[in-house]
Interface confidence: low
């Protein structure tokens, strides 16, 4: 065992090159100088090291930089980044957007891993702010990242970033966030034709105001119930029975199943019962026939 730790004669690495792929793990450990590895990290990614060999290289870097890697090394980690744990990454101070891009590229096409989440957390905290370039980068790699931002942070997201968003990326957005994202989406998709526009805007409608819902009801969009249930209650309440019927099209029948849930429940309470009866769905809870409906919001505006 003792002699195995010494580098065999003539095997000492002078540079990081492809010859190293033929080294056994112990030879890499013994024959590759950690400082040399650190200065030539950019070459590692081009060499088809095995996962076991990458473990050795990581171990060497860990010994050289016990307090965390410098950014010059981090930027060139390449696939070695996949070997890092969140604990390793917490030691880093990443301030360059180029470094962030390089590491996100390694994980491209995969879900956001704990490593990536930690990296982004370190980056944002290291920079002290979420500037437009950072947001552009993060939303390009992880459109779903939008939903982890506060409305204030979202206010600096350019509408161009919205194009990369898939419906599932907005699953974790709450109404506050959709209030900010919806106008951007409306702007981004405004030049599309009716049916194409609805397909793109649908995921953002949780932030839509009443007047936009009224406009959509005139376009034969056939909104599904799942989308309708995510609409803002205050935006749905002023819609008439006829407008909801046009908005939902054949999906209007689904209102019965949702009559006890918001926003359907609250909307029903605002409608005349005889109007609800025209739907033929047996929806109950509307304003009884013959009752006077006072528009209190209009009354407040006048007083």
């Amino acid at each position: 065992e003792v002699e195995k730790t010494a580098c065999p004669s003539g095997k000492k690495a002078r540079e990081i090159d492809e010859s190293l792929i033929f080294y056994k793990k112990w030879e890499l450990e013994a024959c590759v100088d950690a400082a040399l590895l650190a200065t030539q990290m950019d070459r590692v990614n081009a060499i088809p090291f095995t996962y076991e060999q990458l473990d050795v290289l990581k171990h060497k870097l860990d010994e050289l930089y016990p307090q965390g890697y410098p950014e010059s090394v981090i930027q060139h980690l390449g696939y070695l980044f996949l070997k890092m744990s969140p604990e390793d990454i917490r030691k880093w101070n990443v301030t360059s957007l180029e470094t962030l891009k390089a590491l996100l590229e390694v994980n491209k096409g995969h879900e956001m891993s704990p490593q990536v989440a930690t990296l982004i957390d370190r980056f944002v905290k290291g920079r002290g702010q979420l500037d437009k370039d950072t947001l552009d980068t993060l939303t390009a790699f992880y459109p779903g990242y939008l939903c982890s931002l506060s409305p204030e942070e979202l206010s600096s997201v350019p509408p161009s970033s919205i194009w990369a968003v898939r419906p599932q990326d907005l699953d974790t957005c709450d109404p506050r966030q959709l209030d900010v994202l919806y106008p951007k989406a409306r702007l981004a998709f405004q030049n599309m034709n009716g049916s194409e526009y609805f397909v793109k805007i649908q995921s953002f409608l949780g932030g839509a105001p009443t007047e936009d819902l009224k406009a959509l009801s005139q376009q034969n969009v056939s909104m599904d119930l799942a989308t309708f249930m995510k609409l803002r209650t205050d935006a749905v309440l002023p819609l008439t029975v006829a407008e909801v019927q046009k908005l939902l099209g054949p999906h209007v029948e689904g209102l019965k199943a949702e009559e006890r849930h918001r926003p359907v429940r609250d909307w029903i309470l605002r409608q005349r019962q005889d109007d609800l009866d025209t739907l033929g769905l047996g929806l109950q809870g509307g304003i009884p026939n013959g009752y006077l409906v006072l528009d209190l919001s209009m009354q407040e505006a006048l007083s």
């Epitope: 704990p114 989440a117 982004i120 957390d121 944002v124 905290k125 002290g128 702010q129 979420l130 982890s148 506060s150 409305p151 204030e152 942070e153 206010s155 699953d171 974790t172 709450d174 109404p175 506050r176």
Partner: antibody, heavy 118, light 107 residues
Framework: ELQLVESGGDLVKPGGSLKLSCAAS????????MSWLRQTPDKRLEWVAT????????YYPDSVKGRFTISRDNAKNTLYLQMSSLKSEDTAMYYC???????????WGQGTTLTVSS | DIQMTQSPASLSISVGETVTITCRAS??????LAWYQQKQGKSPQLLVY???NLADGVPSRFSGSGSGSQYSLKINSLQSEDFGTYYC?????????FGGGTKLDIK
């Protein structure tokens, strides 16, 4: 070292008002959302208010909406909570906390005590 | 509002043992969950965010797991400094609410 230090807690009569302050240091205050939380005598934790980094957005639970106002002075690295129409159920230890990258709270102050009693 | 239910409410356990605390949300919170530790007379401290991510400086004996509406915090080989009260908190839209807490006592 990251630090949040609350002050201003007191004994107040029901219906009264009080303003709490939180002095922040050790991080870029103006880049972080901030919150007030409270812990009632029975040890329950409740979120009270949140303000975004630039101070343009504020959020409150229904229990304090219209009575409490969160604000911040980024030049002074200070967070405030103005409380009015106080009720006995507002009696609690009040903490200021920094918002993480999501809406969790990654650093808390040591707290300041508000007692509402006649 | 989303209700967070923690169990058990209290637990007596010995140093070196493993403990699991659970938190149930009244609806799907999509991993939007944090765990905090609070020691007697101190303020809460973040342990875990987004269900599984350990906060800075938290020992690796702590781990978070779960999805949908069910989450848990596991502490392996309990140390004396781990005793205190643990809270879960969802951040799936306002109002953000906390569980009632789980008090960990030394047996």
């Amino acid at each position: 070292e990251l630090q949040l230090v609350e002050s201003g807690g007191d004994l107040v009569k029901p219906g009264g008002s009080l303003k709490l302050s939180c002095a922040a240091s050790g991080f870029t205050f103006s880049s972080n959302g901030m919150s007030w939380l409270r812990q009632t005598p029975d040890k329950r934790l409740e979120w009270v208010a949140t303000i975004s980094s630039g101070g343009r957005y504020t959020y409150y639970p229904d229990s304090v909406k219209g009575r409490f106002t969160i604000s911040r002075d980024n030049a002074k690295n200070t967070l405030y909570l103005q409380m009015s129409s106080l009720k006995s159920e507002d009696t609690a230890m009040y903490y200021c906390a920094r918002r993480g990258i999501y809406d969790y709270f990654d650093c808390w102050g040591q707290g300041t005590t508000l007692t509402v009693s006649s | 509002d989303i209700q967070m239910t923690q169990s058990p409410a209290s637990l007596s356990i010995s140093v070196g043992e493993t403990v699991t605390i659970t938190c149930r949300a009244s609806e799907n919170i999509h991993s939007s969950l944090a765990w905090y530790q609070q020691k007697q007379g101190k303020s809460p401290q973040l342990l875990v965010y987004a269900a599984t991510n350990l906060a800075d400086g938290v020992p690796s004996r702590f781990s978070g797991s779960g999805s949908g509406s069910q989450y848990s915090l596991k502490i392996n080989s309990l140390q004396s400094e781990d005793f205190g009260t643990y809270y879960c908190q969802h951040f799936w839209g306002t109002p953000w609410t906390f569980g009632g807490g789980t008090k960990l006592d030394i047996k």
